[in-house]
Interface confidence: medium
């Protein structure tokens, strides 16, 4: 009879063989069947489940000169780069007629050296601070043991025997390398080294020590650096926004910000070149040879207000019989903080000087003692903001009223 | 290192001045931060009695407005307590210490002078 | 002035244990800028006030990390992880958010 027709009877004359490797081997299972008829398509099973993307090969070669005679076809499925997910169980499948018939199974299995499904990555750690390195890898065969290598000296008396996945290191003080080795009854697998980098630890007690109109002085405590000294620190301080840009914990400011650096000791730094009464924040980051700590938060800080640096301008003093009229200009020099008023003396020769608080004005009548005979008056202003008074104008004499006569209007007279 | 070493008598009579003196080495008191008193009384209440800043201004406790006085001597670097007209309820540990501009956290402290007020 | 209260007035811890001490401001200690205006002291038996914390979270130097600040604006929390017999005092807190300065009444931290 015919082969394929009968149900008992397989079609099959060669089964798929046994493949054991390593990762990465290349390997070709192979099945043979001899069918009446035209040749049927060979699918290949693994698990039981048909590939739908196998790279497979089929070869077909008639035995007679009809179409109704025998055919051998052969069927290879190529296994590339053998991984974990290829092992199982292959077999082929053909449906003839309204049979289906399957291969005996060969299998496909993985055992070499371990395999890194995880290795420990290059990271910057501050000084004395704790962390974990993790590293995984598997066989078959298994069991997979590690052994944890720092600086290249085991961290354990055998694989196995040590932290397994994850490596605690509870602080470092200088920079290190890390490795692990997986270990199975087909040898050793060394994973890649990372190198942990020892930075400065980030600064603490970040505060102002004292505070002019123009600069600050602020003060840090260092964290620790381990093997490594500080080579400096570096302090940024930028406009605040009102309290709208850089809140507490913002990372980054919403300007360019003004960079200072201070050699360490002492771990102090004077920032000038700054405006008066206006608020900043500031941080600080210190550095060693192996590069910067993180920064602070943001501290918010203010500078105080200053006195005017300027006299008022434009000063001009006219006097008419016992009166006199003073009017001036704001300082063009800056005011170092919000003004609240001006002050004016005057003094004539042989009498007392007279202070006044003027407020905001900037002008004033002056009512003089007697009837105006007082010889040689002079009179000075100064500008004031809550820091006190800035420096008065130079003296300016009171110049007598001339009014221009013409007949058609009277002189002029002070109320 | 910073330090702040007090001393002052012990005993002071009702209705005088108390006087404490803060001796600070390591840091120039014109030069930065504000330089307070605080007194602990014998149930252990921490009261603020007041400061005097660097740039020699002062603020005190609204409480004591009217008897304290801090000032100072910059040259010798020292800071001074006077309390006037005391009383039995002015009886306590009295400590100075440094303290920040922004905002007054007090880093170091005196050793601490228990002064009684007794006749 | 801003009121500080504490609680308990005192705790018994054994060692090796965490203590938490809690602390009531009378009104919020939160500034506009960000930062949270409380500090912890302890004083050790015959000794000085030294600070703990401030800023409400902020270790200040050379304080061992077994010791944290949490809360928010008006309640507050400090915590010691393991104790130690080292830790043995009166624990104060304090509010630098304005003057006049106030502190709590403080707590006294003993070994079972």
């Known amino acids: 009879a015919p082969r394929g027709t009968q149900a008992e009877e397989s079609p099959f004359v060669g089964n798929p063989g046994n493949i054991t490797g390593a990762r990465g081997l290349t390997g070709t299972l192979r099945c043979q069947l001899q069918v009446q008829g035209e040749p049927p398509e060979v699918h290949w099973l693994r698990d039981g489940q048909i590939l739908e993307l196998a790279d497979s090969t089929q070869t077909q070669v008639p035995l007679g000169e009809d179409e109704q005679d025998d055919w051998i076809v052969v069927s290879q499925l190529r296994i590339t780069s053998l991984q974990l997910s290829d092992t199982g169980q292959y077999q082929c499948l053909v449906f003839l007629g309204h049979q289906t018939f399957v291969s005996q199974p060969g299998y496909v299995g993985l055992e070499g050296l371990p395999y890194f499904l995880e290795e420990p990555e290059d990271r910057t750690v501050a000084a004395n601070t704790p962390f974990n390195l993790s590293c995984q890898a598997q066989g078959p065969p298994e069991p997979v043991d590690l052994l944890w290598l720092q600086d290249a000296v085991p961290l354990a008396t055998a694989p196995g025997h040590g932290p397994q996945r994850s490596l605690h290191v509870p602080g470092l003080n200088k920079t290190s390398s890390f490795s692990c080795e997986a270990h199975n009854a087909k040898g050793v697998t060394t994973s890649r080294t990372a190198t942990i980098t020892v930075l400065p630890q980030q600064p603490r007690n970040l505060h102002l020590v004292s505070r002019q109109p123009t600069e600050l002085e602020v003060a840090w405590t260092p964290g620790l650096s381990g093997i490594y000294p500080l080579t400096h620190c570096t302090l940024q301080a930028v406009l605040s926004d009102d309290g709208m840009g850089i809140q507490a914990g913002e990372p980054d400011p919403p300007e360019e910000p003004l960079t200072s650096q201070a050699s360490v000791p002492p771990h102090q730094l004077r920032l000038g070149s700054l405006h008066p009464h206006t608020p900043y924040h500031i941080r600080v980051a210190c550095t060693s040879s192996q590069g910067p700590s993180s920064w602070t938060h943001w501290l918010p800080v203010e500078t105080p207000e200053g006195v005017p640096l300027g006299p008022p301008e434009n000063i001009s003093a006219t006097r008419n019989g016992s009166q006199a009229f003073v009017h001036w200009q704001e300082p063009r020099a800056p005011l170092q903080g919000t003004l609240l008023g001006y002050r004016l003396a005057y003094q004539g020769q042989d009498t007392p000087e007279v202070l006044m608080d003027i407020g905001l004005r900037q002008e004033v009548t002056l009512e003089l003692q007697g009837d105006g005979s007082v010889s040689n008056l002079t009179v000075c202003v100064a500008a004031y903001t809550a820091a006190g008074d800035g420096p008065w104008s130079l003296p300016v004499p009171l110049e007598a009223w001339r009014p221009v006569k013409e007949p058609s209007t009277p002189a002029f007279s002070w109320p | 290192q910073v330090q702040l070493v007090q001393s002052g008598p012990g005993l002071v009579k009702p209705s005088q001045s108390l006087s404490l003196t803060c001796s600070v080495t390591?840091?120039?008191?014109?030069?930065?931060?504000?330089w307070n008193w605080i007194r602990q009384f014998p149930g252990q209440k921490l009261e603020w009695m007041g400061y005097?800043?660097?740039?020699?201004?002062?603020n005190y406790d609204p409480s004591l407005k009217n008897r304290i006085s801090i000032t100072r001597d910059t040259s010798k670097n020292q800071f001074f307590l006077k309390l006037n007209s005391v009383t039995s309820e002015d009886t306590a540990t009295y400590y100075c210490?440094?303290?920040?501009?922004?905002?007054?956290?007090?880093?170091?402290w005196g050793q601490g002078t228990t002064v009684t007020v007794s006749s | 002035d801003i009121v500080m209260t504490q609680s308990p007035s005192s705790v018994s811890v054994t060692l090796g244990q965490s203590a938490s001490i809690s602390c009531r401001s009378s009104?919020?200690?939160?500034?506009?800028?960000?930062?949270?205006?409380l500090y912890w002291y302890l004083q050790k038996p015959g000794q000085s006030p030294q600070l703990l914390i401030y800023?409400?979270?902020n270790l200040a130097s050379g304080v061992p990390d077994r010791f944290s600040g949490s809360g928010s604006g008006t309640d507050f929390t400090l915590k010691i992880s393991r104790v130690e017999a080292e830790d043995v005092g009166v624990y104060y807190c304090?509010?630098?958010?304005?003057?006049?300065?106030?502190f709590g009444g403080g707590t006294k931290l003993e070994i079972k």
């Open positions: 210490a440094r303290g920040w501009l922004l905002h007054y956290t007090m880093d170091y």
């Open positions: 390591g840091f120039s008191i014109s030069s930065g931060y504000y």
């Open positions: 005097r800043s660097y740039d020699g201004s002062n």
């Open positions: 009104r919020s200690l939160l500034h506009s800028n960000g930062f949270t205006y």
């Open positions: 800023q409400m979270s």
């Open positions: 304090g509010q630098n958010l304005e003057l006049p300065l106030t």
